[in-house]
Interface confidence: low
Amino acid sequence: PQIFNKSNDGFTTTRSYGTVCPKDWEFYQARCFFLSTSESSWNESRDFCKGKGSTLAIVNTPEKLKFLQDITDAEKYFIGLIYHREEKRWRWINNSVFNGNVTNQNQNFNCATIGLTKTFDAASCDISYRRICEKNAK
């Protein structure tokens, strides 16, 4: 069957039969990703994604990280990874532990970005960055 790039209901079929993401969202492995062009703090970024029926992206596989890095245009984006100082560990916003490496760590950098480098970078939660939202594809 033919795959249409655009449909009248504001959804786009992307890279998978019968699986759709909203317009301007990217499809990858049954998930939809939105890369914002505006910026805000981490808390406001979390609310921004929530307003779109999504969460900040949980980039918990190397394949997902590579996919997102390929489309981030040398920009920095907040993701759903925060440092729990009392535990001395990074956790995704679904509460799962991140055991990988986060560069640029600093006692004031409790949030994380991807996009400008090939790694997860610690960042100030109060500085404005773009954000990546994630939700299930329909």
Partner: antibody
Framework: QSLEESGGDLVKPGASLTLTCTAS?????????MCWVRQAPGKCLEWIGC???????TYYASWAKGRFTISKTSSTSVTLQMTRLTAADTATYFC????????????????WGPGTLVTVSS | AIVMTQTPSSKSVPVGDTVTINCQAS????????LAWFQQKPGQPPKLLIY???TLASGVPSRFKGSGSGTHFTLTISDVVPDDAATYYC????????????FGCGTEVVVK
């Protein structure tokens, strides 16, 4: 490439007014911001707010929140809706483009319209 | 909200001299030293001269130089020519969660 503002007028206090900024020779880039800045006669430049073209996110100076609204109406135009106008809103209103705020692209309004005059007087 | 304070408010300078304009931010500007300088002549919109503190905008002569970091920034115009007579504004950016951008109130440069 150019920008042009329109819609400036003489209005009475309490009135509403919508200004339009139209791009010629280019369409708004998804990564750019379209912003409004005003300047009262003989006074400083005053930032009003910006709209991120790609995702529609807007942000405003604290004094403008609730009274001023920036919207994208097409790939080449944005509007500034102003309500409950007072004499203090009398100014020339400029629209300006900021190519990108993110990454290392930095900040700087690289393209401005000539401005449109709004006069609020009874 | 960030507040940008410019000094002096006016400066008279002979042709060929150097003029320095200062801009102080009430708080540190956002990462990458997001501070810009604009030139405005009567009846015209502002023109971008410098962005990210020291990067010259396209077509701007190298006589214009921006420097500084954090809260203190400077615009230096060397070998001043009559066409440099204008009002110069700095603008700082801190991000959407802190009321966005703010302009200084300008420094008028008079060329003698």
């Amino acid at each position: 490439q150019s920008l042009e503002e329109s819609g400036g007028d003489l209005v009475k206090p309490g009135a509403s007014l919508t200004l339009t900024c139209t791009a010629s020779g280019f369409s708004f880039s998804r990564s750019s911001y379209m912003c409004w800045v005003r300047q009262a006669p003989g006074k400083c430049l005053e930032w009003i707010g910006c709209l991120s073209v790609g995702d529609g996110h807007t942000y405003y100076a604290s004094w403008a929140k609730g009274r001023f609204t920036i919207s994208k109406t097409s790939s080449t135009s944005v509007t500034l809706q102003m309500t409950r106008l007072t004499a203090a809103d009398t100014a020339t209103y400029f629209c300006a483009r900021a190519p990108s705020y993110s990454g290392d692209g930095g900040h700087g309004y690289d393209l401005w319209g000539p401005g449109t005059l709004v006069t609020v007087s009874s | 909200a960030i507040v940008m304070t410019q000094t002096p408010s006016s400066k008279s300078v002979p042709v060929g001299d150097t003029v320095t304009i200062n801009c102080q931010a009430s708080e540190s500007v956002d990462r990458n030293n997001r501070l810009a300088w604009f030139q405005q002549k009567p009846g015209q919109p502002p023109k971008l001269l410098i962005y990210t503190t020291s990067t010259l905008a396209s077509g701007v002569p190298s006589r214009f130089k921006g420097s500084g970091s954090g809260t203190h920034f400077t615009l230096t115009i060397s070998d001043v020519v009559p066409d440099d007579a204008a009002t110069y504004y700095c603008a700082g950016y801190r991000g959407a969660h802190t009321d966005g951008d703010a302009f200084g109130c300008g420094t008028e440069v008079v060329v003698k």
